[in-house]
């Protein structure tokens, strides 16, 4: 799997989990998440060869029609597989609030 | 929706379907597939601005990052969202067999 | 230009549920909470509650909770305020209202034209 | 529940005149070093506009006629060079604890 496990502590070029630290106020704008201040969402990158982590048979065939015309523009794209929630604290008013976020960080990555 | 109804009739430059056309011998190398010869499988592509069909939480708040840091790698992609069946011909000898090639059309695109 | 554009006029009957929608357009819809606030004919302002579209968190002022649900559509960037078991008290203009932005409950920077709700049998 | 008491209930003021409109909380609105009170003006037949924010920060697109101050319990709006305009409800509003609310307006 192209997950945190393996492409965190590998040198892999092509479509894995790379990391990625968002801070809420600098990279979103958003002022009014208490806890935490970021977090590690991580994101996709990396090229699509045939036959690599591929997550439809139309991604297969994409990819191997690629395979026979290099110059298409045509190609399967690296992205998010398995993403996990992130809990946050923000207040309103004086009381504090624990919430949930859904789909924020992202753990494994396929091409698409 | 980012479906062939509006992609097809748009001259839209971010995420669409577009159009394509793949010849299962020429381009896939297939030659076991008696009919049909090929068949519009259509692909996805372009830019997936802040907000463009954006597909879980975790592609919003990526995009927003994006905005915030034009420069980044990290960014969400253009890729498939429905995807449809293609029945296609083939034999056994010389007996016809039909199937159902699934998710083998693309319909519709995301950003993800 | 940052709208927020509200549905229009409703007369209902006692007991009956109403839906306000707030359509908005120039700011990202989904990143901002926002408020619903009602001024009944001649009276002050009343904070009903607030919702942050991208994960449907909602907070509720205790005075209306169980009658007001806010939910949001991000694909339409539209927030909805629905109210039920409506009585002659609840006659009002209910206006959507967009945070400020730097806290969850926050000064309302933009506002909708608001929505005239009528109870009558 | 905070109570917000403005003072006076409705005013009447020549133009080129200077206004003060008084907003009391049953508590103090202080926390993290910020006064948690706004100030908005309704005119007739139109919704409320922002005008303060944070008890003395101006609002973008806003006359500087206008001015707050004050802080924990006690705050001010003041409306220097009052215009024919500047006609409406002033209605000041917490943020420091749920729920937020508004004062009954000042006319």
């Known amino acids: 799997a192209l997950d945190t496990n393996y492409c965190f502590s590998s040198t892999e070029k092509n479509c894995c989990v790379r990391q990625l630290y968002i801070d809420f106020r600098k990279d979103l704008g958003w002022k009014w998440i208490h806890e935490p201040k970021g977090y590690h969402a991580n994101f996709c990158l990396g090229p699509c060869p045939y036959i690599w982590s591929l997550d439809t048979q139309y991604s297969k065939v994409l990819a191997l029609y690629n395979q026979h015309n290099p110059g298409a523009s045509a190609a399967p794209c690296c992205v998010p597989q398995a993403l996990e929630p992130l809990p946050i604290v923000y207040y309103v008013g004086r009381k504090p609030k624990v919430e949930q976020l859904s789909n924020m960080i992202v753990r494994s990555c396929k091409c698409s | 929706a980012l479906d062939t109804n509006y992609c097809f009739s748009s001259t839209e430059k971010n995420c669409c379907v577009r159009q394509l056309y793949i010849d299962f011998r020429k381009d896939l190398g297939w030659k076991w597939i008696h009919e049909p010869k090929g068949y519009h499988a259509n692909f996805c592509l372009g830019p997936c601005p802040y907000i463009w069909s954006l597909d879980t939480q975790y592609s919003k708040v990526l995009a927003l990052y994006n905005q915030h840091n034009p420069g980044a790698s990290a960014a969400p992609c253009c890729v498939p969202q429905a995807l449809e069946p293609l029945p296609i011909v083939y034999y056994v000898g010389r007996k016809p067999k039909v199937e159902q090639l699934s998710n083998m059309i693309v319909r519709s695109c995301k950003c993800s | 230009e940052v709208q927020l554009v509200q549905s229009g006029a409703e007369v209902k009957k006692p007991g009956a549920s109403v839906k306000v929608s707030c359509k908005t357009s120039?700011?990202?819809?989904?990143?901002?909470?926002m408020n619903w606030v009602r001024q009944a004919p001649g009276a002050g302002l009343d904070w009903m509650g607030q919702?942050?579209?991208?994960?449907?968190?909602?907070n509720y002022n205790e005075m209306f909770e169980g009658r007001v649900t806010l939910t949001a559509d991000t694909s339409t960037s539209t927030a909805y305020m629905e109210l039920s078991s409506l009585r002659a008290g609840d006659i009002a203009v209910y206006y959507c209202?967009?945070?400020?932005?730097?806290?969850?409950?926050?000064?309302?920077?933009?506002w909708g034209q608001g929505t005239l709700v009528t109870v009558s049998s | 529940d905070i109570v917000m008491t403005q003072t006076p209930p409705s005013l009447s003021v020549s133009p080129r005149e200077t206004a003060s409109i008084s907003c009391r909380a049953s508590?103090?609105?202080?926390?993290?070093?910020?006064?948690?009170m706004h100030w908005y003006l309704q005119k007739p037949g139109q919704s409320p506009q922002l005008l303060i924010y944070?008890?003395?920060n101006l609002e973008s697109g806003v006359s500087d006629r206008f001015s707050g101050s004050g802080s924990g319990t006690d705050f001010t709006l003041r409306i220097s060079r009052v215009e024919a305009n500047d006609t409406g409800v002033y209605y000041c509003?917490?943020?420091?604890?749920?729920?937020?609310?508004f004062g009954q307006g000042t006319k």
């Open positions: 509003q917490q943020n420091d604890e749920d729920p937020l609310s």
């Open positions: 944070l008890a003395s």
């Open positions: 209202a967009r945070g400020y932005g730097n806290y969850a409950l926050d000064a309302m920077d933009y």
């Open positions: 508590e103090s609105v202080d926390s993290y070093g910020n006064s948690f």
């Open positions: 919702i942050f579209p991208a994960w449907g968190m909602t």
């Open positions: 120039g700011y990202t819809f989904m990143f901002y909470w």
